[in-house]
Amino acid sequence: EPHSLRYNLTVLSWDGSVQSGFLAEVHLDGQPFLRYDRQKCRAKPQGQWAEDVLGNKTWDRETRDLTGNGKDLRMTLAHIKDQKEGLHSLQEIRVCEIHEDNSTRSSQHFYYDGELFLSQNVETEEWTVPQSSRAQTLAMNVRNFLKEDAMKTKTHYHAMHADCLQELRRYLESSVVLRRRVPPMVNVTRSEASEGNITVTCRASSFYPRNITLTWRQDGVSLSHDTQQWGDVLPDGNGTYQTWVATRICQGEEQRFTCYMEHSGNHSTHPVPSGKVLVLQSHWQHHHHHHGLNDIFEAQKIEWHE
């Protein structure tokens, strides 16, 4: 997977009036990395691993960048015509990537009230607009404003791209990111499914990087995809990931089944625990980490694009 830096900024308006402040989150290699603290008006690292990336360096540059971007986005929202009454949001997602062959990619996406209406591939300078008439109108609005604004020239976008890549490279200088390998903890549980059947669940947690193979085997042979259920690979809030795989088997055949895990060149197999069947109250939880933004967005039913 490529290394990536992803900026996620949102500004809000109420009854046509753009609100002060903004919401911002930065992901590094798919992990929550920075968040803009609106109370302290500062960029704050998300968790210990994020703090370790810069060591004892300050987060002044990040604070300055996010503040500038937030201000730009507020101005853009102010230029969107026909804002109906009530709450509205403008969200900008900017991503830059460095691939294994050292090639780079950069893109930018705008969402209004959670709906994508404008995308740009920075390298090719190509803008894309979805088919819907609402998206077309919004895109025309924003593009006209961006053209008017002398700052928003081609040069500006390339500079933004270059800044993003520069920051990403700066973070990658930290061995915490580049050579980070956290092996998963693997745990197999069983629960009663129906008469004569049990569900066996294999959970892998606290691993990094994200790529993992987790599958059930019968007699050493991988079960077909349609007989297994997979959970998403999700951040667990500690700079690592979690996932699970489950299958249904006949009670008494447990010895034939093992969970096979492969991660970062290492592998392991895990048998089904024998003994009394555990009736688990809840399955593997699907945590969607919105880091405090959740409340605002849930309350207003605005979609937060991860």
Partner: antibody
């Protein structure tokens, strides 16, 4: 290339025991099970059991419980089958096999002939 | 235990012939049926797994079919190197069991 190299032929006396080895190469040994199969002279094949080299867990055919013991040595990527209290019924060619994770008995060793005779 | 029956113990065919070897299970094995080739020197190779999936490196003249209890292996264009004994094996239920084998000879 996956290879399973088995130990040479054995001539043993009734009541004695024998240890057949199977050295794996060309893949990560602890990734895949090792299976053992018996073929008596001019007869069909019989599955003895298998071992997971990662954790040493075994699953055996009831018929061979008490007769065959399966072990591995991870450091040398070698699987072993120990046969005890040998009788003429145990005279056979013994094969080890492994999987690619998609099919049983995907790759086979060349076989080890065990002859039990006084 | 599930019995695997290969009714034809030996079969004579000419080079270029289409040959079919059959195998019957004593109960439904849900397509968990594999075919192996054993050469006269004792070398064993997997040909087909899960009824019809061709193992990598196996010539496409080999094919498998069947369901439930009845399965077959077909060699579409018999070659000299196909002279061997063919075994079916079920992987559905423990213990795994093999058919008694079908020895293929050239006329």
């Amino acid at each position: 290339e996956v290879q399973l190299q088995q130990s040479g032929p054995e001539l043993v006396k009734p009541g004695a025991s024998v240890k057949v080895s199977c050295k794996a190469s060309g893949y990560a040994f602890t990734k895949y099970n090792i299976y053992w199969v018996k073929q008596s002279h001019g007869k069909s094949l019989e599955w003895i059991g298998y071992i997971d080299p990662y954790n040493g867990g075994t699953v055996q055919n009831q018929k061979f419980k008490g007769k065959a013991t399966l072990t591995v040595d991870k450091s040398s990527s070698t699987a072993y089958m120990h046969l005890n209290s040998l009788t003429s019924e145990d005279s056979a060619v013994y094969y080890c096999a492994t999987t690619d994770g998609y099919s049983l008995f995907t790759y086979w060793g060349q076989g080890t002939l065990v002859t039990v005779s006084s | 235990d599930i019995q695997m029956t290969q009714t034809t113990s030996s079969l004579s065919a000419s080079l270029g012939d289409r040959v079919t070897i059959s195998c019957r299970a004593s109960q439904d094995i849900g397509n968990y049926l594999n075919w192996y080739q054993q050469k006269p020197d004792g070398t064993v190779k997997l040909l087909i797994y899960y009824t019809s999936r061709l193992h990598s490196g196996v010539p496409s003249r080999f094919s498998g079919s069947g369901s439930g209890t009845d399965y077959s292996l077909t060699i579409s264009n018999l070659e000299q190197e196909d002279i061997a004994t063919y075994f079916c094996q079920q992987g559905n239920t423990l213990p795994f069991t093999f058919g008694s084998g079908t020895k293929l000879e050239i006329k």
